[in-house]
Protein backbone atom coordinates (compact mmCIF):
# COMPACT_ATOMS: atom_id res chain seq x y z
CA UNK A 1 0.00 0.00 0.00
CA UNK A 2 2.84 2.36 0.89
CA UNK A 3 4.51 1.57 -2.45
CA UNK A 4 1.23 2.32 -4.27
CA UNK A 5 0.88 5.64 -2.42
CA UNK A 6 4.42 6.55 -3.35
CA UNK A 7 3.72 5.86 -7.01
CA UNK A 8 0.41 7.71 -6.73
CA UNK A 9 2.18 10.74 -5.23
CA UNK A 10 4.76 10.70 -8.01
CA UNK A 11 2.04 10.46 -10.62
CA UNK A 12 0.20 13.36 -8.99
CA UNK A 13 3.39 15.41 -8.84
CA UNK A 14 4.04 14.95 -12.55
CA UNK A 15 0.38 15.69 -13.34
CA UNK A 16 0.62 18.92 -11.36
CA UNK A 17 3.83 19.88 -13.13
CA UNK A 18 2.24 19.26 -16.52
CA UNK A 19 -1.01 21.06 -15.72
CA UNK A 20 -1.54 24.71 -16.62
CA UNK A 21 -3.66 26.06 -13.78
CA UNK A 22 -3.47 29.67 -14.92
CA UNK A 23 -6.86 29.64 -16.68
CA UNK A 24 -8.41 28.55 -13.36
CA UNK A 25 -6.69 31.40 -11.52
CA UNK A 26 -7.78 33.90 -14.16
CA UNK A 27 -11.35 32.62 -14.16
CA UNK A 28 -11.64 32.79 -10.35
CA UNK A 29 -10.09 36.26 -10.02
CA UNK A 30 -12.38 37.60 -12.74
CA UNK A 31 -15.35 36.00 -11.03
CA UNK A 32 -14.77 37.50 -7.60
CA UNK A 33 -13.95 40.90 -9.11
CA UNK A 34 -17.12 40.85 -11.18
CA UNK A 35 -19.23 39.82 -8.19
CA UNK A 36 -17.80 42.66 -6.16
CA UNK A 37 -18.47 45.14 -8.96
CA UNK A 38 -22.02 44.01 -9.58
CA UNK A 39 -23.00 44.13 -5.90
CA UNK A 40 -21.17 47.43 -5.44
CA UNK A 41 -19.85 46.32 -2.08
CA UNK A 42 -16.94 47.89 -0.25
CA UNK A 43 -14.12 48.38 -1.27
CA UNK A 44 -15.34 49.44 -4.73
CA UNK A 45 -18.72 50.30 -6.09
CA UNK A 46 -19.23 50.13 -9.85
CA UNK A 47 -18.42 53.41 -11.54
CA UNK A 48 -19.53 51.86 -14.82
CA UNK A 49 -22.01 49.23 -15.85
CA UNK A 50 -20.38 46.08 -14.45
CA UNK A 51 -21.00 44.29 -17.71
CA UNK A 52 -19.75 46.98 -20.06
CA UNK A 53 -16.70 45.96 -22.08
CA UNK A 54 -13.27 46.63 -20.63
CA UNK A 55 -9.83 45.39 -21.62
CA UNK A 56 -9.69 43.30 -18.45
CA UNK A 57 -12.11 41.36 -16.33
CA UNK A 58 -15.42 42.45 -17.79
CA UNK A 59 -15.06 40.29 -20.89
CA UNK A 60 -17.80 37.73 -20.36
CA UNK A 61 -16.50 35.70 -23.28
CA UNK A 62 -12.95 35.82 -21.94
CA UNK A 63 -14.10 34.50 -18.61
CA UNK A 64 -16.06 31.56 -20.03
CA UNK A 65 -13.07 30.77 -22.23
CA UNK A 66 -10.88 30.68 -19.10
CA UNK A 67 -13.45 28.44 -17.40
CA UNK A 68 -13.50 26.02 -20.33
CA UNK A 69 -9.71 25.78 -20.39
CA UNK A 70 -9.66 25.47 -16.61
CA UNK A 71 -12.13 22.59 -16.68
CA UNK A 72 -10.05 20.82 -19.32
CA UNK A 73 -7.04 21.02 -17.00
CA UNK A 74 -8.97 19.90 -13.90
CA UNK A 75 -10.37 16.98 -15.87
CA UNK A 76 -6.90 15.43 -15.67
CA UNK A 77 -7.35 15.03 -11.91
CA UNK A 78 -10.84 13.51 -12.06
CA UNK A 79 -9.70 10.01 -11.02
CA UNK A 80 -7.49 11.13 -8.17
CA UNK A 81 -9.32 13.08 -5.50
CA UNK A 82 -6.22 13.76 -3.46
CA UNK A 83 -4.44 15.12 -6.52
CA UNK A 84 -7.48 17.26 -7.36
CA UNK A 85 -7.19 18.71 -3.87
CA UNK A 86 -3.50 19.45 -4.40
CA UNK A 87 -4.34 21.26 -7.64
CA UNK A 88 -6.89 23.41 -5.79
CA UNK A 89 -4.34 24.07 -3.03
CA UNK A 90 -1.81 25.16 -5.64
CA UNK A 91 -4.31 27.62 -7.14
CA UNK A 92 -4.99 29.03 -3.67
CA UNK A 93 -1.27 29.33 -2.95
CA UNK A 94 -0.59 31.07 -6.27
CA UNK A 95 -3.25 33.74 -5.67
CA UNK A 96 -3.10 34.17 -1.89
CA UNK A 97 -0.78 37.18 -1.99
CA UNK A 98 -3.20 38.96 -4.36
CA UNK A 99 -5.95 38.79 -1.73
CA UNK A 100 -5.25 41.39 0.94
CA UNK A 101 -8.66 41.19 2.60
CA UNK A 102 -10.44 38.53 4.61
CA UNK A 103 -13.63 38.79 2.52
CA UNK A 104 -11.71 38.48 -0.75
CA UNK A 105 -9.86 35.43 0.57
CA UNK A 106 -13.05 33.74 1.75
CA UNK A 107 -14.87 34.47 -1.48
CA UNK A 108 -11.97 33.12 -3.53
CA UNK A 109 -11.93 29.97 -1.37
CA UNK A 110 -15.69 29.53 -1.82
CA UNK A 111 -15.45 29.82 -5.59
CA UNK A 112 -12.44 27.51 -5.63
CA UNK A 113 -14.31 24.81 -3.71
CA UNK A 114 -17.17 25.05 -6.22
CA UNK A 115 -14.84 24.85 -9.20
CA UNK A 116 -14.81 21.05 -9.72
CA UNK A 117 -18.61 20.98 -9.49
CA UNK A 118 -18.86 23.84 -12.04
CA UNK A 119 -16.75 21.68 -14.35
CA UNK A 120 -19.02 18.67 -13.83
CA UNK A 121 -16.35 16.89 -11.80
CA UNK A 122 -16.40 15.36 -8.35
CA UNK A 123 -15.18 17.74 -5.66
CA UNK A 124 -12.65 16.34 -3.15
CA UNK A 125 -14.41 15.53 0.12
CA UNK A 126 -11.82 16.95 2.49
CA UNK A 127 -9.50 19.60 1.11
CA UNK A 128 -7.79 22.17 3.33
CA UNK A 129 -7.43 25.45 1.45
CA UNK A 130 -6.06 27.47 4.37
CA UNK A 131 -3.11 29.77 3.72
CA UNK A 132 -1.51 32.39 5.93
CA UNK A 133 -3.86 35.36 5.98
CA UNK A 134 -3.06 38.05 3.45
CA UNK A 135 -0.87 35.77 1.40
CA UNK A 136 2.80 34.90 1.63
CA UNK A 137 5.56 37.48 1.83
CA UNK A 138 7.57 36.27 -1.15
CA UNK A 139 9.68 39.28 -1.87
Amino acid sequence: RQQWELQGDRRCQSQLERANLRPCEQHLMQKIQRDEDSYGRDPYSPSQDPYSPSPYDRRGAGSSQHQERCCNELNEFENNQRCMCEALQQIMENQSDRLQGRQQEQQFKRELRNLPQQCGLRAPQRCDLEVESGGRDRY
Partner: antibody
Framework: QVQLVESGGGVVQPGRSLRLSCAAS????????MHWVRQAPGKGLEWVAA????????YYADSVKGRFTISRDNSKNTLYLQMNSLRAEDTAVYYC???????????WGQGTLVTVSS | DIVMTQSPLSLPVTPGEPASISCRSS???????????LDWYLQKPGQSPQLLIY???KRASGVPDRFSGSGSGTDFTLKISRVEAEDVGVYYC????????FGQGTKVEIK
Protein backbone atom coordinates in the same frame (compact mmCIF):
# COMPACT_ATOMS: atom_id res chain seq x y z
CA GLN B 1 -17.50 57.27 7.68
CA VAL B 2 -13.93 56.01 7.36
CA GLN B 3 -11.32 57.65 9.57
CA LEU B 4 -7.64 56.88 9.96
CA VAL B 5 -5.84 59.09 12.47
CA GLU B 6 -2.06 58.95 12.81
CA SER B 7 -0.24 60.10 15.95
CA GLY B 8 3.18 59.84 17.62
CA GLY B 9 5.15 62.07 15.24
CA GLY B 10 7.58 64.69 16.46
CA VAL B 11 11.23 65.73 16.54
CA VAL B 12 13.75 63.04 17.39
CA GLN B 13 17.54 62.78 17.29
CA PRO B 14 19.34 60.48 14.84
CA GLY B 15 19.81 56.98 16.22
CA ARG B 16 16.80 57.27 18.53
CA SER B 17 13.41 55.54 18.32
CA LEU B 18 9.80 56.57 17.83
CA ARG B 19 6.51 54.70 17.66
CA LEU B 20 3.69 55.86 15.39
CA SER B 21 0.06 54.83 15.85
CA CYS B 22 -2.88 54.86 13.48
CA ALA B 23 -6.36 54.62 15.01
CA ALA B 24 -9.05 53.37 12.63
CA SER B 25 -12.79 53.86 12.82
CA UNK B 26 -15.70 53.36 10.42
CA UNK B 27 -13.98 50.43 8.69
CA UNK B 28 -13.71 46.69 9.23
CA UNK B 29 -10.12 47.18 10.44
CA UNK B 30 -9.36 43.52 11.11
CA UNK B 31 -10.49 42.48 7.62
CA UNK B 32 -7.80 44.25 5.60
CA UNK B 33 -4.07 44.62 5.09
CA MET B 34 -2.79 47.98 6.39
CA HIS B 35 0.10 50.09 5.07
CA TRP B 36 2.47 52.86 6.06
CA VAL B 37 3.54 55.30 3.32
CA ARG B 38 5.81 58.30 3.83
CA GLN B 39 6.53 61.57 2.05
CA ALA B 40 9.71 63.57 2.68
CA PRO B 41 9.21 67.38 2.58
CA GLY B 42 8.69 68.48 -1.04
CA LYS B 43 9.24 64.92 -2.32
CA GLY B 44 7.14 62.05 -3.66
CA LEU B 45 5.41 59.14 -1.96
CA GLU B 46 7.41 56.16 -0.69
CA TRP B 47 5.74 52.93 0.44
CA VAL B 48 7.25 51.84 3.78
CA ALA B 49 5.56 48.73 5.15
CA ALA B 50 2.39 46.63 5.19
CA UNK B 51 0.84 44.01 7.46
CA UNK B 52 -1.78 41.40 6.57
CA UNK B 53 -5.16 41.45 8.28
CA UNK B 54 -4.28 38.82 10.87
CA UNK B 55 -0.77 40.20 11.37
CA UNK B 56 0.85 37.02 10.04
CA UNK B 57 2.63 38.61 7.08
CA UNK B 58 4.75 41.73 7.21
CA TYR B 59 6.23 43.46 4.18
CA TYR B 60 8.94 46.15 4.23
CA ALA B 61 10.70 48.50 1.83
CA ASP B 62 14.44 47.83 1.60
CA SER B 63 15.18 51.31 2.99
CA VAL B 64 13.61 50.45 6.39
CA LYS B 65 14.16 46.68 6.64
CA GLY B 66 15.73 45.74 9.97
CA ARG B 67 15.03 49.15 11.51
CA PHE B 68 11.23 49.54 11.33
CA THR B 69 8.62 47.08 12.62
CA ILE B 70 4.97 47.17 11.64
CA SER B 71 2.35 45.65 13.96
CA ARG B 72 -1.35 45.86 14.68
CA ASP B 73 -3.77 45.36 17.55
CA ASN B 74 -7.10 44.35 16.03
CA SER B 75 -8.86 44.51 19.40
CA LYS B 76 -7.98 48.24 19.53
CA ASN B 77 -8.38 48.92 15.78
CA THR B 78 -4.85 50.32 15.81
CA LEU B 79 -1.85 50.04 13.51
CA TYR B 80 1.70 50.74 14.72
CA LEU B 81 5.09 51.54 13.25
CA GLN B 82 8.07 51.12 15.57
CA MET B 83 10.96 53.10 14.11
CA ASN B 84 14.45 52.40 15.48
CA SER B 85 17.91 53.75 14.52
CA LEU B 86 16.30 56.76 12.91
CA ARG B 87 18.23 58.70 10.25
CA ALA B 88 17.87 62.21 8.82
CA GLU B 89 16.48 60.67 5.61
CA ASP B 90 13.55 59.21 7.59
CA THR B 91 12.21 62.75 8.02
CA ALA B 92 8.77 62.71 6.40
CA VAL B 93 5.03 62.85 6.83
CA TYR B 94 3.93 59.27 7.60
CA TYR B 95 0.51 58.17 6.34
CA CYS B 96 -1.34 55.01 7.24
CA UNK B 97 -3.59 53.52 4.56
CA UNK B 98 -6.04 50.65 4.32
CA UNK B 99 -5.75 48.15 1.49
CA UNK B 100 -8.77 47.64 -0.76
CA UNK B 101 -8.38 43.88 -0.52
CA UNK B 102 -6.75 43.78 -3.95
CA UNK B 103 -3.46 45.56 -3.16
CA UNK B 104 -4.64 49.14 -3.80
CA UNK B 105 -4.42 51.81 -1.09
CA UNK B 106 -8.05 52.79 -0.71
CA UNK B 107 -8.34 54.90 2.46
CA TRP B 108 -5.64 57.25 3.76
CA GLY B 109 -5.09 59.13 7.02
CA GLN B 110 -4.03 62.78 7.21
CA GLY B 111 -0.46 61.93 8.19
CA THR B 112 1.90 62.69 11.08
CA LEU B 113 5.23 64.50 10.68
CA VAL B 114 8.45 62.88 11.89
CA THR B 115 11.56 65.06 11.96
CA VAL B 116 14.92 63.44 12.59
CA SER B 117 17.43 66.12 13.49
CA SER B 118 20.22 66.75 15.96
CA ASP C 1 12.98 45.78 -7.23
CA ILE C 2 10.52 47.21 -9.73
CA VAL C 3 11.30 50.81 -10.71
CA MET C 4 8.47 53.10 -11.83
CA THR C 5 9.19 56.02 -14.16
CA GLN C 6 6.64 58.76 -14.90
CA SER C 7 6.63 61.37 -17.62
CA PRO C 8 6.34 64.25 -17.84
CA LEU C 9 7.32 65.34 -14.32
CA SER C 10 5.49 68.63 -14.81
CA LEU C 11 2.38 69.17 -16.92
CA PRO C 12 0.86 72.62 -17.46
CA VAL C 13 -2.77 72.19 -18.56
CA THR C 14 -5.62 74.29 -19.89
CA PRO C 15 -9.09 73.72 -18.36
CA GLY C 16 -11.37 71.95 -20.81
CA GLU C 17 -8.43 70.42 -22.68
CA PRO C 18 -7.33 66.78 -22.46
CA ALA C 19 -4.20 65.69 -20.60
CA SER C 20 -2.26 62.46 -20.29
CA ILE C 21 0.49 61.08 -18.06
CA SER C 22 2.68 58.13 -18.86
CA CYS C 23 4.06 55.54 -16.45
CA ARG C 24 6.61 52.86 -17.29
CA SER C 25 7.70 49.95 -15.11
CA SER C 26 11.08 48.20 -15.23
CA UNK C 27 9.30 44.85 -15.58
CA UNK C 28 5.88 43.61 -16.60
CA UNK C 29 3.10 44.20 -14.07
CA UNK C 30 0.87 41.43 -15.41
CA UNK C 31 0.27 38.77 -12.79
CA UNK C 32 -0.37 35.15 -13.78
CA UNK C 33 -4.06 35.82 -13.04
CA UNK C 34 -4.18 38.21 -16.01
CA UNK C 35 -4.46 41.47 -14.06
CA UNK C 36 -2.08 44.42 -14.33
CA UNK C 37 -1.18 45.54 -10.81
CA LEU C 38 -0.90 49.27 -11.52
CA ASP C 39 -2.75 52.05 -9.68
CA TRP C 40 -3.02 55.81 -10.13
CA TYR C 41 -3.30 58.23 -7.18
CA LEU C 42 -3.88 61.97 -6.99
CA GLN C 43 -2.55 64.13 -4.18
CA LYS C 44 -4.21 67.52 -4.21
CA PRO C 45 -2.33 70.44 -2.59
CA GLY C 46 -2.34 70.09 1.21
CA GLN C 47 -4.27 66.81 1.13
CA SER C 48 -3.62 63.09 1.50
CA PRO C 49 -3.41 60.99 -1.67
CA GLN C 50 -6.57 59.42 -3.08
CA LEU C 51 -7.03 56.35 -5.27
CA LEU C 52 -8.21 57.12 -8.82
CA ILE C 53 -7.58 53.97 -10.87
CA TYR C 54 -6.76 50.43 -9.80
CA UNK C 55 -5.69 47.39 -11.81
CA UNK C 56 -4.65 49.69 -14.64
CA UNK C 57 -8.12 50.57 -15.94
CA LYS C 58 -10.79 50.40 -13.22
CA ARG C 59 -12.08 53.63 -11.76
CA ALA C 60 -12.39 53.70 -7.99
CA SER C 61 -15.76 54.57 -6.50
CA GLY C 62 -16.69 58.26 -6.81
CA VAL C 63 -13.99 59.07 -9.37
CA PRO C 64 -15.37 61.17 -12.28
CA ASP C 65 -15.50 59.39 -15.63
CA ARG C 66 -13.23 61.99 -17.23
CA PHE C 67 -10.40 59.96 -15.67
CA SER C 68 -9.40 56.77 -17.46
CA GLY C 69 -6.49 54.38 -17.23
CA SER C 70 -5.08 52.15 -19.94
CA GLY C 71 -2.05 50.04 -20.77
CA SER C 72 -0.64 46.62 -20.04
CA GLY C 73 2.71 45.03 -19.23
CA THR C 74 5.20 47.85 -18.75
CA ASP C 75 3.49 50.89 -20.34
CA PHE C 76 0.52 52.66 -18.78
CA THR C 77 -1.34 55.92 -19.33
CA LEU C 78 -3.68 58.05 -17.24
CA LYS C 79 -5.93 60.29 -19.33
CA ILE C 80 -8.11 63.20 -18.28
CA SER C 81 -10.59 63.85 -21.09
CA ARG C 82 -11.32 67.45 -20.06
CA VAL C 83 -9.22 68.95 -17.30
CA GLU C 84 -11.02 70.86 -14.55
CA ALA C 85 -9.46 73.32 -12.10
CA GLU C 86 -9.96 70.83 -9.24
CA ASP C 87 -7.74 68.26 -11.01
CA VAL C 88 -4.52 70.09 -10.11
CA GLY C 89 -2.08 68.24 -7.88
CA VAL C 90 0.53 65.52 -8.11
CA TYR C 91 -0.37 62.26 -9.85
CA TYR C 92 1.44 59.07 -8.89
CA CYS C 93 1.43 55.65 -10.48
CA UNK C 94 2.10 52.70 -8.17
CA UNK C 95 2.92 49.07 -8.88
CA UNK C 96 1.48 46.42 -6.57
CA UNK C 97 2.83 43.32 -8.26
CA UNK C 98 5.83 42.86 -5.94
CA UNK C 99 5.28 44.63 -2.65
CA UNK C 100 4.49 48.27 -3.61
CA UNK C 101 6.45 51.06 -5.38
CA PHE C 102 5.43 54.57 -6.45
CA GLY C 103 6.55 56.55 -9.46
CA GLN C 104 8.20 59.92 -8.80
CA GLY C 105 5.01 61.88 -9.48
CA THR C 106 3.71 64.28 -12.15
CA LYS C 107 2.76 67.79 -11.08
CA VAL C 108 -0.31 69.01 -12.96
CA GLU C 109 -0.97 72.75 -12.80
CA ILE C 110 -3.12 75.24 -14.68
CA LYS C 111 -1.26 77.23 -17.36
Amino acid sequence: QVQLVESGGGVVQPGRSLRLSCAASGIAFNDYTMHWVRQAPGKGLEWVAAISYGGTNKYYADSVKGRFTISRDNSKNTLYLQMNSLRAEDTAVYYCARDSGYRSLLHWGQGTLVTVSS
Amino acid sequence: DIVMTQSPLSLPVTPGEPASISCRSSQSLVHRNGYNYLDWYLQKPGQSPQLLIYMASKRASGVPDRFSGSGSGTDFTLKISRVEAEDVGVYYCMQALQTWTFGQGTKVEIK
